[in-house]
């Protein structure tokens, strides 16, 4: 480091910043000698408000350093993002953000939930850190399969429904009157057939949540950014495969009214047997042959496979047959059943476990004069597409 | 030796998201300093808008705060601005500088004009 | 902080040695810059922390002050000179002053 120059003068000895050190130390600085500045754990080198990664300072021939010494700071991670359907609440103390300060991040009670613990330190890196070593923010994603509806296991027949009984219905609206289920924030479960046509017409699809009254002024409004039919759906062919999810341009906020239903778990195969009872809502067409003006309910219960392949063997849908990837619903006798306009509606059902409603079923098709007899309801079996949801939803 | 150079849209319509890209050549982001979006309205007034310093981290004038976003991709030694909700008052030349408060030379792009207009 | 050029112009001759002032409205201590611009051009740095002259710039180009005051002097005007200059305050965020332009009387 040393070079003896006796014509420059040596330079002034540098002093180390507060929570700083100077390397190398020497008795004296002369032309082209160097010092570099260090910080301690959790300050960084700041030229006033200019960041430094690194800081040398050489002597030049007049005895002065060609640089003055920056200051070493205390690392401030700043004020933390906001988390969406979240708040943030500081822990060490009001608006502090320094090096390990702590904050909590926790989501909107009962309508959203957090899979960490949401504590975060200010590292010395000058990012606020999970306790798992994540930078990213956590994600409060929507409680799912809450309802204010209470299944009495018997048929109760259509019914209409209560606010907050079915909030993840959602109503499409293009040329034909249609459903879907909400599933998370911003995606959609449907039946292909009812959206068919739609990938490129997108703008022709209004969606509509948090309502009970079909043509009510009041609604929470969405439109879709996507829409993705089944790639073994074939339209006019059957009803085979017949599913799609609606991928939302924006977020809707969940509510005691919107709320998405949750998908099934592994064990839900237990809960779908013949004459378990699943509960289907739409506005479809009731008895009288008109769309309903009230969102109206039915609960109905599971048809033996086989019966229900052979009854439609016997009288047959144009065109469609019973596949693996359907389940059916309804009554021997008839009078229960979802109908055209139901299309897309999920067929829900209570886990005894997790106290928690989910899809089994997306309305699908069935008998001409709904609610025959032994012209059971129709339905995607949802569980045959978890993979297939789980796969678009990730890879958007 | 150090350059910048600015690129996007020289139009963008009111209400819609300004997106620009500086890349750098001769020098890594990671490496050190402060990599700033500046812009210069007509009439020469200048105003710094925000930097994304080596480590990463953002620093962001509080007047745009609510509307500026400044991310980097280290592997193609690019730094970016989006600016959203754009008024003509967002019309200006935009550049991108590297600025050490001394500590290393200050290089600035050669600047890119965008006019705000429907 | 505002960075406050009070002269918009000032007019100089070859030759001559001109001062342009800058005031911050806090103190910053001496983290400001100076900078030339001239027509069609990038803004080009001559001085940082308040008097430390980049290697390149001619030593006709000279930075003082500390705080609140700061001076850029150019001594021996030369035709090249003839641009605007701009202060930078670098302390907390950063701000430009509106600038001072330079032209011959």
């Known amino acids: 480091h040393h070079h003896h120059h006796h014509a420059s003068q040596p330079c002034p000895d540098p002093t180390a910043p507060p929570n700083g050190h100077i390397s190398p130390v020497q008795a004296t600085y002369v032309l082209k000698d160097s010092f570099s500045v260090f910080c301690k754990t959790g300050f960084e080198l700041l030229q006033g408000s200019v960041p430094l990664k690194s800081f040398t300072a050489v002597c030049q021939k007049d005895g002065s350093w060609d640089r003055p010494i920056p200051e070493c700071s205390i690392i401030d991670c700043g004020p933390p993002d906001d988390l969406p359907n979240g708040h943030v609440d500081y822990i060490t103390g009001p608006e502090v953000t320094t090096y390990k300060a702590v904050i909590q991040y926790s989501c909107e009670e009962t309508f959203y939930t957090m899979s960490s613990n949401g504590k975060y330190v200010c590292e010395a890196d000058g990012f606020w850190t999970s306790s798992k070593g994540e930078k990213s923010l956590p994600v409060c994603k929507p409680v799912c399969g809450l309802s204010t509806h209470t299944s009495g296991g018997r048929i109760i027949g259509g019914q209409p429904a209560k606010p907050g009984d079915f909030p993840w219905q959602v109503l499409l609206l293009g040329e034909t009157t249609a459903a879907g289920a909400l599933i998370h924030d911003d995606w959609v479960l449907t039946a292909a057939h009812a959206v068919y046509g739609k990938t490129e017409a997108m703008s022709s699809l209004d969606i509509r949540m948090g309502i009970l009254k079909r043509l009510s002024l009041i609604y929470t409004q969405a439109w879709p950014e996507a829409v993705f039919i089944h790639e073994g759906y074939t339209h006019g062919a059957g009803f085979d495969n017949d599913i799609a999810l609606i991928k939302l341009k924006n977020k809707v906020t969940i509510n005691r009214n919107i709320m998405p239903i949750c998908l099934p778990r592994k064990e839900a195969a237990s809960l779908m047997k013949t004459d378990f009872v699943g509960t289907v809502a739409g506005w479809g067409l009731t008895q009288k042959g008109f769309l309903a003006r009230n969102l109206m309910f039915v609960d109905i219960p599971i048809v033996d496979h086989q019966k229900c392949a052979t009854a439609y063997t016997k009288q047959p849908y144009p065109g469609a047959k019973v596949t693996v990837n359907m389940l059916c619903a309804g009554l021997d006798r008839g009078g229960k059943d979802s109908c055209r306009g139901d299309a897309g509606g999920a067929l829900v059902f209570l886990d005894n476990e997790t106290q928690r409603w989910f899809v089994g079923g997306i309305v699908s098709w069935g008998s001409i004069n709904c609610g025959g007899s032994e012209q059971y309801g129709v339905y995607t079996k949802v569980t045959n597409y978890i993979p297939w949801i789980e796969n678009i939803i990730n890879n958007f | 030796d150090v350059q910048l150079q600015e690129s996007g849209p020289g139009l963008v319509k009111p209400s819609q998201s300004l997106s620009l890209t500086c890349t750098v050549t001769?020098?890594?982001?990671?490496?050190?300093?402060?990599w700033n979006w500046i812009r210069q309205f007509p009439g020469n007034k200048l105003e710094w808008m925000g930097y994304?310093?080596?480590?990463?981290?953002?620093s962001y004038n509080p007047s745009l705060k609510s509307r500026i976003s400044i991310t980097r991709d280290t592997s193609k030694n690019q730094f970016f601005l989006q600016l959203n909700s754009v008024t003509t008052e967002d019309t200006a030349t935009y550049y991108c500088?590297?600025?050490?408060?001394?500590?290393?030379?200050?290089?600035w792009g050669q600047g890119t004009s965008v006019t705000v207009s429907s | 902080i505002v960075m406050t050029q009070s002269q918009k112009f000032m007019s100089t001759s070859v030759g001559d040695r001109v001062s342009v002032t800058c005031k911050a409205s806090q103190n910053v201590d001496t983290n400001v810059a100076w900078y030339q611009q001239k027509p069609g051009q990038s803004p080009k740095a001559l001085i940082y922390s308040a008097s430390y002259r980049y290697s390149g710039v001619p030593d006709r180009f000279t930075g003082s002050g500390s705080g609140t005051d700061f001076t850029l002097t150019i001594s021996n005007v030369q035709s090249e000179d003839l641009a605007e200059y701009f202060c930078l305050q670098y302390n907390s965020y950063l701000t430009f002053g509106s600038g001072t332009k330079l032209e011959l009387k």
């Open positions: 994304i310093s080596y480590s990463g981290r953002t």
């Open positions: 001769g020098y890594s982001i990671t490496s050190d300093y402060a």
């Open positions: 500088a590297k600025l050490g408060g001394g500590h290393g030379m200050d290089y």
